[in-house]
């Protein structure tokens, strides 16, 4: 069961896995959640009754029964991990801790104007886990305004002490605020010959890359496939680092694959969720339970529902045995990965999906779409919303996209004639406009945020955010779309779709059923040739067929240009402008979302 509240003056007895230092009980709970085995924790707050060397200790605990005996102890704060909870989890921690010095390896010292600048520096430094900043009131003159960037093996401080006039905080990489490049490529037949900080077993290079991403010290990795000549190293995932942050040497070796941590792409691709099944593969580990199951999918469900289960192996039933049910072996290990991986035994293995809630909701696979045709089916574009105005009468105004549980991204030009957010209604999970009746539930709009530089669509900056009055509960029919990663600027998207209820020709009316059209992207150089009287900037992106025929039109404005990349849908464009609709050699012009990711995050993550 999910228990979120913290237990004051309470200590859990026994079950210790490890001790780390955290600046608050709240952060201790996050660390426990992300630890492969931690289910409960006890944090010691600063207190005159406690030995200062025990202040800020966060003891991570495990228990077969999922609970431990409680003992009263002043200054102790205990609680449960969020593993038991179904809600979205994030490691993003923007808190600044006043008068705390978080100890680690001080590898970089520089002058900064403010703690915020120091935190930004940490966020944009590949090695930095946390920082301490000496304020201008710091007693020692030569240390004032000094920003110390720090890292540790665990990503958490080695100790935390009280120190007047300093502030500390964590890197905001996990908040998707880093400007570091997102390098998704996996390099075949390549070994990175740098120092290993850890090694785990993984079924493929993708899982290895994801493990590297959420390992605090891993910057890149090398994976030896099951065809690797040295048997003892098959399926070995080597987690690596280097001083420069880049591999120093690349060696060409067959059957090895290498790649980079996806730390800077975390908000737009799954890094915790290993959802694939591995056929003819057995995962070895500590056995938690053996249960009968109808299929490997059922076995994965059982593992996901068992809070201590990390991975499983399913052995299909021998003909007519046990009512056709196979054996489902629920397993765990100290680090969440199999201790060994064996092939050729007929098992089907996989991982718990419990960790999927640590990934951005937008990375969840949606049900397969019907290709061809122009009318969409229910749940095909679950991020698409219809924005209505109620003044002077209620009508569809524009499209928009869910990008967070309280945020809609749309076009600025949609708000011509909108005097106040009070007249707006956002409807999600809608296929047909005719579904919208008096009593249909909608989201009210709390705030309209227009880009400061917007003047008219043709000049760019045609982007706006709507902050909703209430939060969206994600379901199959309403869920967010991922923003593109800043590190993905060079990705060539080939599977792009424009959707909306807009006109199907220049003189028309709003359509009842959500329409879709697959449209190829056009280079900005090509687009500029088609719009000689306009300036097509890098903040715009164009899409269309040379011969015309398929395009967004009036009423589609603000809606998404959605592109599928690596099995994840990304919001590449916002329908903005174009000469006419679907005209020959007149592509549609869209707001290039990747160029506004910083703006979006600044506005949506403002405290």
């Amino acid at each position: 069961e999910c228990v979120t509240q913290l237990l004051k003056d309470t200590c859990f007895e026994g079950g210790d896995i490890t001790t780390v230092f955290t600046p608050s009980a709240k952060y201790c709970q996050v660390v426990c959640t992300y630890h492969p085995r931690c289910l409960l924790f006890t944090f010691t707050a600063e207190s005159p009754s406690e030995d200062p060397t025990r202040w800020f200790t966060c003891v991570l605990k495990d228990s077969v029964t999922e609970t431990l005996p409680r003992v009263n102890r002043t200054a102790a704060i205990s609680g449960y991990s969020f593993k038991q909870c179904s809600h979205q989890i994030s490691a993003c921690n923007k808190d600044i801790y006043v008068d705390l010095d978080m100890k680690g390896i001080n590898y970089n010292s520089s002058v900064a104007k403010s703690a915020q600048e120091c935190q930004e520096r940490c966020t944009d430094d590949v090695h930095c886990h946390f920082f301490t900043y000496a304020t201008r009131q710091f007693p020692s003159l030569e240390h004032r305004n000094i920003c110390l960037l720090k890292h540790t093996q665990t990503g958490t401080p080695t100790r935390i002490t009280k120190l007047d006039k300093v502030v500390s905080g964590f890197s905001l990489k996990s908040c998707a605020l880093s400007n570091l490049a997102c390098i998704r490529d996996i390099f075949p037949n390549t070994v990175f010959a740098d120092s290993n900080i850890d090694s785990v077993m993984a079924p493929d290079a993708f899982v290895c890359g994801r493990i590297c991403t959420h390992h605090p010290g891993c910057l890149f990795f090398t994976f030896f496939s099951q065809e690797w000549p040295k048997e003892s190293q098959r399926n070995l995932c080597l987690l690596k680092t280097s001083e420069s942050g880049l591999p120093s040497t690349r060696i060409k070796k067959s059957k090895a694959l290498s790649g980079f941590s996806l730390q800077s792409c975390r908000h737009s691709i799954p890094v915790f969720c290993h959802s694939s099944f591995y056929h003819d593969t057995d995962f070895l580990g500590e056995e938690l339970d053996i249960v009968a199951a109808k299929s490997h999918e059922a076995c994965q469900k059982l593992c996901t529902n068992a809070v201590r289960c990390q991975f499983f192996t399913y052995t299909p039933a021998q003909a007519s045995c046990n009512e056709g049910k196979g054996k489902c072996y629920l397993k765990l290990s100290s680090n969440g990965s199999p201790t060994k991986i064996l092939h050729g035994r007929g098992g089907i293995s996989g991982y718990t999906l419990r960790l999927c809630k640590m990934d951005n909701e937008c990375t969840t696979k949606i049900k397969p779409r019907i290709v061809g045709g122009t009318a969409s089916v229910r749940g095909e574009w679950p991020w698409q919303v219809t924005l209505h105005t109620t003044s002077p009468t209620q009508r569809h105004l524009c499209g928009g996209s869910i990008i967070g549980n309280q945020w809609i991204l749309t076009a600025a030009h949609c708000f011509y004639g909108v005097e106040s957010p009070k007249i707006l209604r956002v409807y999600s999970g809608i296929l047909n406009q005719s579904e919208i009746k008096e009593d249909t539930s909608f989201f009210g709009v709390q705030e309209i945020i227009i880009h400061d530089q917007y003047k008219m669509a043709e000049s760019g900056y045609d982007i706006a955010l709507l902050k909703l009055e209430t939060t969206v509960n994600y379901t199959d029919s309403q869920r967010p779309i991922c923003l593109p990663s800043k590190g993905d600027r060079n990705v060539i998207y080939t599977d792009c779709w424009v959707t909306g209820w807009g006109y199907r020709k220049l003189r028309d009316k709003i359509q009842n059923t959500l329409q879709k059209a697959k449209i190829p992207l056009v280079t900005n150089e090509e687009c500029q040739k088609r719009y000689r009287g306009h300036k097509i900037t890098h903040k715009m992106i164009c899409a269309g067929y040379r011969e015309g025929g398929k395009d967004a039109c009036k009423g589609d404005s603000g809606g998404p240009l959605s592109c599928k990349h690596n099995e994840v849908w990304h919001l590449v464009g916002i329908t903005s402008w174009g000469e006419g609709c679907a005209q020959r050699e007149r592509p549609g012009v869209y707001t290039n979302v990747v160029e506004y990711v910083d703006w979006i995050l600044e506005k949506t993550q403002a405290v």
Epitope: F415, G417, V418, Y454, S557, W577, E579
Partner: antibody, heavy 118, light 112 residues
């Protein structure tokens, strides 16, 4: 609530420079653009200039060389200067604010009558 | 610049009767973003102008439904279905599709 109030000289001499101030309340100049519009006695409205949220400016092309629009967001003021005034510039000068975007103009000042005469 | 031409320049109407004002632009006002930035304002005697219609045909909240706007491209019309005494003043069309923005020369409505 939203208010705009124009202020400046009632009388200016020909060739002089007119400086008008629009003081706003109930909203921030970093979130909305403001325009100046004038109306000679018994004649039509004429759009003069706009200052956008980000400080960019747009001008009536016929009068562009004579106009400068600026703002001081902290003081909630928009200033219009018009050089080389002429009796034909005698008019009521209004400042106005749009809704969410630059137009339509929903909020208007009450206007200030400027007479150009020696 | 876009020139806005209104006709007639003045009109005298009996209360309860309809009135119609035409506004023609020198270029199409249909913006490439799908909006048509054409607005109608009424300036009552001794007052600042007030918004009636935006986007060709959208009545601003609080504006009586006897006012309606129509048109597309370069030809636009403001209609008053039944004129009332309080409708007297000067009516202006205004375009914000192309910078610099421009007003029509105004149409004075009087009551017979």
């Amino acid at each position: 609530q939203v208010t705009l109030k124009e202020s400046g000289p009632v009388l200016v001499k020909p060739t002089e420079t007119l400086t008008l101030t629009c003081t706003v309340s109930g909203f921030s100049l970093s979130s909305y653009s403001v325009a100046w519009i004038r109306q000679p006695p018994g004649k039509a409205l004429e759009w003069l200039a706009e200052i956008w949220r980000d400080g960019d400016t747009s001008y009536n092309s016929r009068l562009k060389s004579r106009l400068t629009i600026s703002k001081d967001t902290s003081k909630s003021q928009v200033v219009l200067t018009m050089t080389n005034m002429d009796p034909v510039d005698t008019a009521t000068y209004y400042c106005a604010r749009g809704m969410t975007l630059a137009t339509p103009f929903l909020y208007w000042g009450q206007g200030t009558l400027v007479t150009v005469s020696s | 610049d876009i020139v806005m031409t209104q006709t007639p320049l003045s009109l005298s109407v009996t209360p309860g009767q309809p009135a119609s004002i035409s506004c023609r632009s020198s270029q199409s006002l249909e913006s490439s973003d799908g909006n048509t930035y054409l607005e109608w304002y009424l300036q009552k005697p001794g007052q600042s102008p007030q918004l009636l219609i935006y986007g060709v045909s959208n009545r601003f909240s609080g504006v009586p439904d006897r006012f309606s706007g129509s048109g597309s491209g370069t030809d636009f019309t403001l209609k008053i279905s039944r004129v009332e005494a309080e409708d007297v003043g000067v009516y202006y069309c205004f375009q914000a599709t192309r910078d610099p923005f421009t007003f029509g020369q105004g149409t004075k409505l009087e009551i017979k």
